[in-house]
């Protein structure tokens, strides 16, 4: 997911950085800009219940991380839900995972110093056909 | 998703910051620490094809963003795929979306100055019942 080594023409108005760790250590403004102006994420909030592979959302809190709260999906069933509302064991509910970037306080408990960290989170579940290995 | 206003006992070894923008502007080490040591994200890489709500992955590249490459899921069908491989008109494929944090170069083209940005990405697709039947 992460690719950062792109040469960019430097803007003369950039903050100066002669830090020996540059470009590893950068300045980040935590005043979040939200690009999701045209989308309402709440509209998909009931999919977890209506999916054929429904999931529950578990709160994962860590004050040493930014954001400190992340919601993790856990599939409710091993199989998928059929039209009758029963579990179909011929199909599998599986988590859809995504690697995301978070900020980890480093050194610990420091309010203004972070390190970028990659974590794997389960966002929701999908219903898949199991892989059947045919024996000759 | 984001919650940052937590009081943390300050570590005396923290870098000093008397910046007037503090705590909005922080130092971040871009040397990514990967916590996913026990997980193999490739294991879910074929779910996009085996799901009853399959999806394609589209590359979204932006050199002004960190990470510069993000993969976006687009559901292949409006309906879901049944056991025969045909569309089931009674079910819908929908994207599972997640708000993630990225770093946006600010001012533009600056290699060492960023602003935190929240964007909504589609991670995969799930199969849902279109109508919720409310029982009296």
């Amino acid at each position: 997911i992460v690719k950062a080594g792109i040469t960019i023409p430097r803007n003369p108005g950039c903050p100066n950085s002669e830090d020996k760790n540059f470009p590893r250590t950068v300045m980040v403004n935590l005043n979040i800009h939200n690009r999701n102006t045209n989308t309402n994420p709440k509209r998909s909030s009931d999919y977890y219940n209506r999916s054929t592979s429904p999931w529950n959302l578990h709160r994962n809190e860590d004050p040493e991380r930014y954001p400190s709260v992340i919601w993790e999906a856990k599939c409710r069933h091993l199989g998928c839900i059929n039209a009758d509302g029963n579990v179909d064991y011929h199909m599998n509910s599986v988590p859809i995972q995504q690697e995301i970037l978070v900020l980890r306080r480093e050194p610990p408990h420091c309010p203004n110093s972070f390190r970028l960290e990659k974590i794997l989170v389960s966002v929701g579940c999908t219903c898949v056909t199991p892989i059947v290995h045919h024996v000759a | 998703i984001v919650k940052a206003g937590i009081t943390i006992p300050r570590n005396p070894g923290c870098p000093n910051s008397e910046d007037k923008n503090f705590p909005r502007t922080v130092m971040v080490n871009l040397n990514i620490h990967n916590r996913n040591t026990n997980t193999n994200p490739k294991r879910s890489s074929d779910y996009y094809n085996r799901s009853t709500s399959p999806w394609n992955l589209h590359r979204n590249e932006d050199p002004e963003r960190y990470p510069s490459v993000i993969w976006e899921a687009k559901c292949r069908h409006l309906g879901c795929i049944n056991a025969d491989g045909n569309v089931d008109y009674h079910m819908n494929s929908v994207p599972i979306q997640q708000e993630i944090l990225v770093l946006r170069r600010e001012p533009p083209h600056c290699p060492n100055s960023f602003r935190l940005e929240k964007i909504l990405v589609s991670v995969g697709c799930t199969c849902v019942t279109p109508i919720v039947h409310h029982v009296a």
Epitope: - | L78, G79, G85, N86, V87, N92, V94, P130, I131
Partner: antibody
């Protein structure tokens, strides 16, 4: 140029049958979902039947279920609608329409329509 | 079935006027909405799908917006060739259903 041409309409008595055809040209017929949509005189549009690209999935609303059958012959680039047990309320212009995708959800090309009149 | 309530059923406006048509679904249709134009004696023509996506070749004066149950179709500057009946159609839940239509006339 995409073209859809319906045929087979006419006047028929209640209880009788009729078969409509839609000849497609100008696109790869076998990769598109198709539908029949009807419009009673002076009225709005009503879905009649849907079929996916390979004929493996179909759908009918309750108003025609059990009486109408949609089918396709991809080797002949033709869509069909078999209408049995016709009723006066089936009187309408019948359009065949193409979905821009495999399945038949919304319609980017329509034929000119064929009029079916059910009357004694 | 999902009911699509379109309003007004007819309207009369002058050339150059901004024209707005609304379509309300009986439940959330998650942006799965199409808009069609039908001229007298002709087949419908697709203008917009996905609530907002303009079809190729459709003039930019036509636009769609909305979410959830409520959707809007706008002609930013009415032209004489826009005289027609306009229909919305949901494709979230079968059977796909159409609004009753809005007949647009020139004053």
């Amino acid at each position: 140029e995409v073209q859809l041409v319906e045929s087979g309409g006419g006047v028929v008595q209640p209880g009788r049958s009729l078969r409509l055809s839609c000849a497609a040209s100008g696109f790869t017929f076998s990769t598109y979902g198709m539908s029949w949509v009807r419009q009673a005189p002076g009225k709005g549009l009503e879905l009649v039947a849907i079929i996916n690209h390979n004929g493996g999935s179909t759908f009918y609303p309750d108003s025609v279920k059990g009486r109408f059958t949609i089918s396709r012959d991809n080797s002949k680039n033709t869509l069909y609608l078999q209408m049995n047990s016709l009723r006066a309320e089936d009187t309408a212009v019948y359009y065949c329409a193409r979905d821009p995708r495999h399945d038949g959800y919304f319609f980017d090309y329509w034929g000119q329509g064929t009029l079916v009149t059910v009357s004694s | 079935d999902i009911q699509m309530t379109q309003s007004p059923s007819s309207l009369s406006a002058s050339v150059g006027d901004r024209v707005t048509i609304t379509c309300q679904a009986s439940e959330d249709i998650y942006d799965r909405l199409a808009w069609y134009q039908q001229k007298p004696g002709k087949a419908p023509k697709l203008l917009i799908s996905g609530a907002t996506s303009l079809e190729t070749g459709v003039p930019s004066r036509f636009s769609g917006s909305g979410s959830g149950k409520d959707y809007t179709f706008t002609i930013s500057s009415l032209q004489p060739e826009d005289i027609a009946t306009y229909y919305c159609q949901q494709y979230w839940s079968v059977p796909w259903t159409f609004g009753g239509g809005t007949k647009v006339e020139i004053k």
